[in-house]
Interface confidence: medium
Amino acid sequence: LIQERRSHEVNPAAHLTGANSSLTGSGGPLLWETQLGLAFLRGLSYHDGALVVTKAGYYYIYSKVQLGGVGCPLGLASTITHGLYKRTPRYPEELELLVSQQSPCGRATSSSRVWWDSSFLGGVVHLEAGEEVVVRVLDERLVRLRDGTRSYFGAFMV
Amino acid sequence: LIQERRSHEVNPAAHLTGANSSLTGSGGPLLWETQLGLAFLRGLSYHDGALVVTKAGYYYIYSKVQLGGVGCPLGLASTITHGLYKRTPRYPEELELLVSQQSPCGRATSSSRVWWDSSFLGGVVHLEAGEEVVVRVLDERLVRLRDGTRSYFGAFMV
Amino acid sequence: LIQERRSHEVNPAAHLTGANSSLTGSGGPLLWETQLGLAFLRGLSYHDGALVVTKAGYYYIYSKVQLGGVGCPLGLASTITHGLYKRTPRYPEELELLVSQQSPCGRATSSSRVWWDSSFLGGVVHLEAGEEVVVRVLDERLVRLRDGTRSYFGAFMV
């Protein structure tokens, strides 16, 4: 694919932020704020947690999630998986794009009850028009939202 | 805002690096090297720790800080906050853009009291001409500088 | 250097993924998949673990490595170093560009000896035609490969 950046076209970009409604507990992807505060969509659209591509090309996609807790919830595996996944009409299952595994629960010190950790992912992937990218965190109970600055999801065409 | 990338214009970008003077202990933002080694400014300017925008648009801004220590300094909260903040003439206080909280002091192993950790932030934000972006780390006593490769701050227009 | 983004030119970009052959144990840089799955090269070339620049300019370069283990291997220092390094014909040694140090082995919880951690690096550097960028991890024994989504290496011109 020869991809050109036309000088008269707007370069697709988006930055979506964490909100109280981000964590559904349903096993689905995280949901995001698309308009308020720092959030915006430019040349990309949004649907049920997904960034939807309107113009095919190579995109740098990224996500950060803020993790935190008091010890580890009962039954929680010691590993948190944070990933960016692609949905495409050409394939029935989500495809892993960028994934991290972390073991943050061991981070509390002897004197500190609370632990915090952060996971950042970013990389370039090719996306066709109509394809979607979502963020998943397993176990999402440890994701800490606050004001849209600590957990977020974005992309821009390169 | 419809933002176009003109083919005859230089795309603003910068990468600033950590230096011995970065940590002031004054409660202000981190200071950065702008010219030596890997550091550069192209279509952005610098003032007292801040990247200053000369051309409005959407920018991918990023920062990494290298953290490290031996145990935790007495009285240090168990959480380190690393953030990118915007200063704008239209508002008296700094605005949080991208923030991470980490509990790195719990990372010392049983055989080693020395620990290292790294915090990376990156995301797309809209910046107007004249607005500034700074990096803050609380508590900055745990930031470890060396040669400009471990702690840095940059941006480029998308 | 005045760098222009011509509208008729392809913008150089690449994303290389971890594979079974990535870890050589030879003391050299990590090796990468360049064609299969999510991996691609566009306006950049590849040679023995290195992204090779064909067009001079400023590039956002990035790498993530997935780390993991059961306790810490005997004799392993408590610090893992993950870095992006430049090779240039003008200088005999590799030059550090972006580096992180982490102490992940302390992350095992009391209930689990298994730990996971991830290291992400990204930043803008100037690269001349013919210069190369490689990824190194010391000690690479703790890098965990799987399917190309957890450890990767990429770049794009800004």
Epitope: L23, L74, L76, S112, R113, V114 | A77, T79 | -
Partner: antibody
């Protein structure tokens, strides 16, 4: 609606062991941190200890040598034992649930027992 | 242990007044912080958790702010049922600690 019902001996002699039990009704036991807090007459609140959602116990160092918190998940109950009591242990004792709100912290105690007045007197 | 210094220890106010209670921690505790209201003979009641989040069912005239070492509880317009003792609490470090309390009385 979650309720905490607590019971135990209200009058003790010095050197005896205080024993209180708290039952959780109308809600889940797992996934929360459970605490004991006390309040001496006319004074402020003092944290005694907790049993966390992962099953670990943590105690106030000032009481650590004398306190034990245990749990019986099959009965949705947790208990407090405080040995070698003195008059200084006279207080109202509360069992408490720590909130667990997805996306924020756990940082608040949202459900309290009715309190048990314990008097230590010879 | 982290000390929480609450001020004032008592205050007199009238219905409709704006009341502010502060709590200062001896070291940083981020947002691991809560405020409670206690009336005589009753268990404390959670008002604010995570430093600034309003507990369900608590009137919106109560608000919390602050992060790090300095925290504030504000009652925007004091109501007759608000006369009580208020406590702050930190959750960041062991042992968990409470402030000494602020008694809000009728002027």
């Amino acid at each position: 609606q979650v309720q905490l019902q607590q019971w135990g001996a209200g009058l003790l002699k010095p050197s005896e062991t205080l024993s209180l039990t708290c039952a959780v009704y109308g809600g889940s036991f797992s996934g929360y941190n459970w605490h004991w807090i006390r309040q001496p007459p006319g004074k402020g609140l003092e944290w005694i200890g907790e049993i966390t959602h992962s099953g670990s116990t943590n105690y106030n160092p000032s009481l650590k040598s004398r306190v034990t918190i245990s749990v019986d998940t099959s009965k949705n109950q947790f208990s407090l034992k405080l040995s070698s009591v003195t008059a200084a242990d006279t207080a109202v004792y509360y069992c408490v649930r720590e909130i667990a709100v997805a996306g924020t912290g756990y940082y608040g105690m949202d459900v309290w027992g009715q309190g048990t007045t314990v008097t230590v007197s010879s | 242990a982290i000390q929480l210094t609450q001020s004032p220890s008592s205050l007199s106010a009238s219905v409709g007044d704006r009341v502010t209670i502060t709590c200062r921690a001896s070291q940083g505790i981020n947002s691991a912080f809560a405020w409670y209201q206690q009336k005589p003979g009753k268990a404390p009641k959670l008002l604010i958790y995570d430093a600034s989040s309003l507990e369900s069912g608590v009137p919106s005239r109560f608000s919390g702010s602050g992060s790090g070492t300095d925290f504030t509880l504000t009652i925007s317009s004091l109501q007759p049922e608000d006369f009580a003792t208020y406590y702050c609490q930190q959750f960041n470090s062991y042992p968990l600690t409470f402030g000494g309390g602020t008694k809000v009385e009728i002027k």
